[in-house]
C-alpha cells in the first residue's frame, strides 16, 4: 500500500510541478519594474523569456516578442534552453510514469518492467526539476547583477534639473512559480525513485523463499510468490493477486516522475 501511495503521490506532485514549469516558462513576469524610486509610475514594465510588456496606468497593455535569436543575451538563451529541456524531460517522464503506475495494468507487464519505468520517470523528473531550478536561478542571478549595476548608475544624465532615471528590474512572479514548480518536480522524482525500490523484486528475498519452499511447500509456493510480486502470468496467479492475497503496496508501488505536461 505504501509503495502504491508513494508512486501515486510522486506522480501527482510531479504532474503539478511540470504544470508549474510550463506555466512559469510561458509567463511574462520573469522580471518586473522595480518601483522603489517611483511607486506612482503611470507606466509599468515587465519581461518574460519570450516577450516584454508595458502596462499603462490607463489599462492598456502592449507586449512585444523578441523577434531575434542572435540579438538576445546568451544567458537568456541558456535559461530558455534549460526550461524547455525541463519541460520536454518532464513530459516524457509523465508519459513513462503513467504506464509505470501500479494501479494501471497494461497487458501482462511485469513488475520489473514497471519498476524500471518508474525509476526512469523518477530520474527524468529529478533532472527536469533541476533544469527548471537552474534556469530560474540563472535568470535571478542575472537580475541581481543588473539591478546593482543600474543602481550604481541610477542617474545616467544629470544636466541641471534634468534627470534620466534608469529602469531597474526585480524578481517577477514567474521566478517564484518556477522555483516552487522545479522543487515539486524534484520531490516527485525522488518519490518515484523511492517507490521503484518497493516495486523491484529483490533477488535475496526470492532465494530465501525458494529455500524455505522445500520445508513449507504449501505456504511458500513459488507461484504464489510470483503472484504477489506480479511475475506470474497464469490465471491462477492473477486470481490470487486480484483477490487481494497481498496488498497492492506490497506488490508494487512506484512514484512516477512525469506529473505535468
Amino acid at each position: 500500500m505504501a509503495v502504491t501511495a508513494c508512486q501515486g503521490l510522486g506522480f501527482v506532485v510531479s504532474l503539478i510541478g511540470i504544470a508549474g514549469i510550463i506555466a512559469a516558462t510561458c509567463m511574462d513576469q520573469w522580471s518586473t519594474q522595480d518601483l522603489y524610486n517611483n511607486p506612482v509610475t503611470a507606466v509599468f514594465n515587465y519581461q518574460g523569456l519570450w516577450r516584454s510588456c508595458v502596462r499603462e496606468s490607463s489599462g492598456f497593455t502592449e507586449c512585444r516578442g523578441y523577434f531575434t535569436l542572435l540579438g538576445l543575451p546568451a544567458m537568456l538563451q541558456a535559461v530558455r534552453a534549460l526550461m524547455i529541456v525541463g519541460i520536454v524531460l518532464g513530459a516524457i517522464g509523465l508519459l513513462v510514469s503513467i504506464f509505470a503506475l501500479k494501479c494501471i495494468r497494461i497487458g501482462s507487464m511485469e513488475d520489473s518492467a514497471k519498476a524500471n519505468m518508474t525509476l526512469t520517470s523518477g530520474i527524468m523528473f529529478i533532472v527536469s526539476g533541476l533544469c527548471a531550478i537552474a534556469g530560474v536561478s540563472v535568470f535571478a542571478n542575472m537580475l541581481v547583477t543588473n539591478f546593482w549595476m543600474s543602481t550604481a548608475n541610477m542617474y545616467t544624465g544629470m544636466g541641471g534639473m534634468v534627470q534620466t532615471v534608469q529602469t531597474r528590474y526585480t524578481f517577477g512572479a514567474a521566478l517564484f512559480v518556477g522555483w516552487v514548480a522545479g522543487g515539486l518536480t524534484l520531490i516527485g522524482g525522488v518519490m518515484m525513485c523511492i517507490a521503484c525500490r518497493g516495486l523491484a523484486p529483490e533477488e535475496t528475498n526470492y532465494k530465501a523463499v525458494s529455500y524455505h519452499a522445500s520445508g513449507h511447500s504449501v505456504a511458500y509456493k513459488p507461484g504464489g510468490f510470483k503472484a504477489s510480486t506480479g511475475f506470474g502470468s497464469n490465471t491462477k496467479n492473477k486470481k490470487i493477486y486480484d483477490g487481494g492475497a497481498r496488498t497492492e503496496d506490497e506488490v508494487q508501488s512506484y512514484p512516477s516522475k512525469h506529473d505535468y505536461v
Epitope: Q33, N38, V40, T41, A42, V43, N45, Y46, Q47, S52, C53, V54, E56, S57, S58, G59, F60, E62, R64, G157, V162, Q163, T164, V165, Q166, T167
Partner: antibody, heavy 118, light 113 residues
C-alpha cells in the same frame, strides 16, 4: 458618441463641501480609468485625481490629498469627486476626462465651475 | 514631481507659416520597456475643454490634421504646426504621462500677428 457631462458645481464657502458628478455615455465606462482635471480662471490645467476602471487604484495631486475623494459607480456610468475642506485656491472649472492609450486623456466633459468664496 | 516647462509662453504668428513650440521635462519621459516617450499634447480653445492632439510624443490622435507633428525624446519635445490656420490660434499644453502626478506645462499661446 462618447459624452461626459459634469454637474454639481456652484458657489461654496471656505471649509465647505461639494460633490461633483460626471455622467458618461457612448462607451463602456467600466473599461476605462477616469480623471478629474481643473483649471483656475485664466490659468493653466492642473491634474487633480485618477481612479482606475475597477476602483482599485487612486492617485491625487498633493494639494487635494486628504480633502478630495474620487469614486465611481460603474453600474450607473458615473464618476464622482467628493470635495471637503474647500479653499479659495480650489476655485476652478473641473473637468472629468477619459484615460486611454498612451496615458492620454482623449475625451473631456464641458466642465463644471466651482467657486469658493466667503 | 516632474516639472514641465513650455516655451515660449506666447507666440505671434501669421497664417500659413510654420510654428514650433518647445516642452521640456525635468525627468526623462522615455520608457525603456517600449522605447516610447510618455508626453501628450493638448489644444484648448477659449471656453472649451482641452482636445487631445498627440500622445507618445508623436502619435496623432484620430481626426487631428497632419499639419500637427510632434518630435523629441527623453526630456526635450517639440510641437510643430507646418502651416498655421486661423483655427489653430489658441493655447497648447504638454503633459507628462509617465508618472503621477500627471503634470501639465503652463501652456503656449498662439496669437495672430
Amino acid at each position: 458618441e462618447v459624452q461626459l457631462v459634469e454637474s454639481g458645481g456652484g458657489s461654496v464657502k471656505p471649509g465647505g463641501s461639494r460633490k461633483l458628478s460626471c455622467a458618461a455615455s457612448g462607451f463602456t465606462f467600466s473599461d476605462y480609468g477616469m480623471h478629474w482635471v481643473r483649471q483656475a480662471p485664466e490659468k493653466g490645467l492642473e491634474w487633480v485625481a485618477y481612479i482606475s476602471s475597477g476602483s482599485n487604484t487612486f492617485y491625487y495631486t498633493d494639494t487635494v490629498k486628504g480633502r478630495f475623494t474620487i469614486s465611481r459607480d460603474n453600474a450607473k456610468n458615473t464618476l464622482f469627486l467628493q470635495m471637503t475642506g474647500l479653499r479659495s485656491e480650489d476655485t476652478a472649472m473641473y473637468y472629468c476626462a477619459r484615460f486611454t492609450r498612451g496615458n492620454a486623456l482623449d475625451y473631456w466633459g464641458q466642465g463644471t465651475s466651482v467657486t469658493v468664496s466667503s | 514631481d516632474i516639472v514641465m516647462t513650455q516655451s515660449p509662453s506666447s507666440l505671434t504668428v501669421t497664417a500659413g507659416e510654420k510654428v514650433t513650440m518647445s516642452c521640456k521635462s525635468s525627468q526623462s519621459l522615455l520608457n525603456s520597456g517600449n522605447q516610447k516617450n510618455y508626453l501628450t499634447w493638448y489644444q484648448q480653445k477659449p471656453g472649451q475643454p482641452p482636445k487631445l492632439l498627440l500622445y507618445w510624443a508623436s502619435t496623432r490622435e484620430s481626426g487631428v490634421p497632419d499639419r500637427f507633428t510632434g518630435s523629441g525624446s527623453g526630456t526635450d519635445f517639440t510641437l510643430t504646426i507646418s502651416s498655421v490656420q486661423a483655427e489653430d490660434l489658441t493655447v497648447y499644453y504638454c503633459q507628462n504621462a509617465y508618472s503621477y502626478p500627471l503634470t501639465f506645462g503652463a501652456g503656449t499661446k498662439l496669437e495672430l500677428k
